[in-house]
């Protein structure tokens, strides 16, 4: 094959090599960029910056090598468009630092930075941590800071991510109230901070105020839906990012729903209860307190992490006619109480008979050869035979 005269030449089926001295000053408009998985660049002293726009369209890129070039700066978001990047070799350039944000979100198996005049500072604390934890092949490189000795020896006592304190009201919050949250940010070299409110949806009207180091957030006209929703304050500095999530408890009275009994291998009277704080529950059977046992007891389904409503069953293991009757669920919290009742009939009374029927002599024996009644314990060992959708 004839030698390739261009600045960049194909290498294999999806690779590109750019090794002609000084031919590149940026990575715009590389040929066949959208299908590239490997890009090798060498001897490009004019290539000094690597930014977001440089790698746009290189979505398939897995290996990137830029060596023996003039790279001085890599933007924190440079690799936003190359999420599949797994090997990054930036050795023998002019890099003094590299932000933690640059590699955030990538699953780098290899990161090579040897031969750069790195400047030891808190901004490289993340790289020091990679070295300590044996990540990305960093320990083998024995990285040095220019004129400062090994990266591993860099003092890091003061290199911490921001510290966040979120103040929430300690008084009870009721539906319709306005709630003021304040996020105090402390730390060195603070860069950015803000609120993440993705879970709130229609739970309140949101108004942000203030800026570093004290961020305010007003949640106006809150609803009960705000319960169990995360309100997150975040802040970043050159060391990394910190987040603190809080939840605002909005008080509201207990409510309860009962549904018709359903038969599994056991019986279930499905219920839903709601309220904040979580209501206490009590069952009545025909008006009297029902004492729960291993044959009749309350069983909750796994709660959804982001809502207060709880679903469950009054579970009855092989109930008989003595369990037929009126079941009432009482739910109460400091803001109110509620109840719901349902009639349940599990089995006819074998001792009730019509005078015209033949008189039973004794309790009929069960067919001793029957195997159809054998229950099967599910392999996942959960006592629920089927899921019951309630509410």
């Amino acid at each position: 094959a004839a030698p390739c005269p261009d600045a960049c030449c194909p290498h294999g089926s999806s690779g590109l090599r750019c090794t002609r001295d000084g031919a590149l000053d940026s990575l715009h408009h590389l040929p066949g960029a959208e299908n590239l998985t490997e890009l090798y660049i060498e001897n490009q002293q004019h290539l000094q910056h690597l930014e977001l726009r440089d790698l746009r369209g290189l979505g398939e890129l897995r290996n990137l090598t830029i060596v023996k070039s003039g790279l001085r700066f890599v933007a924190p978001d440079a690799f936003h468009f190359t999420p599949r990047l797994s090997r990054l070799n930036l050795s023998f350039n002019a890099l003094e630092s590299l932000s933690w944000k640059t590699v955030q979100g990538l699953s780098l198996q290899e990161l090579v930075l040897s031969g750069n005049p790195l400047h030891c500072s808190c901004a490289l604390r993340w790289l020091q941590r990679w070295e300590e934890e044996g990540l990305g092949g960093v320990p083998e490189q024995k990285l040095q800071c220019h004129g400062q000795g090994p990266l591993a020896h860099m003092p890091n006592a003061s290199c911490g991510v921001p510290t966040l304190k979120v103040q929430v009201p300690n008084a009870s919050v009721d539906v319709g109230d306005d709630v003021l949250l304040r996020c105090q940010v402390e730390g060195r070299g603070l860069e950015q901070a803000g609120w993440i409110l993705t879970e709130l949806e229609q739970s309140a009207t949101v108004m942000k105020s203030g800026g570093l180091p004290s961020l305010g957030l007003t949640l106006a006209n809150v609803t009960s839906d705000l319960n169990r929703k995360n309100v997150t304050c975040w802040a970043e500095n050159d060391v990394g990012r910190a987040e603190v999530s809080v939840q605002v408890n909005v008080s509201f009275p207990a409510s309860v729903q009962l549904h018709t009994a359903v038969e599994m291998h056991h019986w279930c009277i499905p219920f839903s209860v709601d309220g904040q704080p979580a209501p206490s529950l009590r069952w009545l059977f025909n008006g009297s307190v029902l004492n729960e046992t291993s044959f009749i007891f309350t069983e909750f389904l796994e709660p959804a992490a982001n809502e207060t409503v709880r679903h469950g069953c009054l579970r009855l293991n092989q109930p008989t006619h003595v369990n037929n009757g009126n079941y009432t669920l009482l739910a109460a919290n400091p803001f109110g109480q509620a109840s719901a009742s349902i009639m349940a009939a599990f089995m006819d009374n074998p001792f009730e008979f019509n005078p015209e029927d033949p008189i039973p002599v004794s309790f009929s024996p069960v067919d001793t050869n029957s195997t159809s009644g054998d229950p099967v314990e599910k392999k996942d060992e959960t006592p629920f035979g089927v899921s019951v959708a309630v509410g």
Epitope: H265, S294, F295, M347, P383
Partner: antibody, heavy 117, light 109 residues
Amino acid sequence: QVQLQQPGVELVKPGASVKLSCKTSGYTFTSYWMHWVKQRPGQGLEWIGEIYSSNGLTNYNEKFKNKATLTVDKSSSTAYMQLTSLTSEDSAIYYCARHWYVFLDHWGQGTTLTVSS
Amino acid sequence: QAVVTQESALTTSPGETVTLTCRSSTGAVTTSNHANWVQEKPDHLFTGLIGGINNRAPGVPARFSGSLIGDKAALTITGAQTEDEAIYFCALWYSNHWVFGGGTRLTVL
């Protein structure tokens, strides 16, 4: 597979207390009730009580109400029975047994408690 | 408290059918008593066999079956085997507590 593991032997002095353990594995501990049963030679089996591992709800045989206290540790999937003011009458084998549906289906191998000075 | 009574001992031969019974001092055993049958083998190895009168526990051989016969709970072993030699305890549920019978020692000769 479902397993209920109990220490083989406990030796304690009269008047003291003891906490017997039943460490479970192979199933979702919090979904089941655990029962405790006493066996004395020549006296058959006596039911002591039951506990719901999910919330610690208990029911006791009247005879053992002031003798036994049942608890659970969800983090280690372990059921416990504390026996207090021990006398020679408490010397016996104590079993934990899992309740599933209408069965006492899986039993521990028992802890032999000896109360002796 | 109720008393639950079982035969103290029974003997059968391999291949034969044998029935063990369980009587309640409070009257007829009913489905509300959720009669359980538990097998004890040497070295204190207990296994639940039958629950709720006639439900076999998972993994229990089909030769074991439970029923109500008259006013008693019954455990029938159809085609007994030598490994069935054991002590069999009946347990009855009385609303909020179990009461065990004294056990039947079954010998398979």
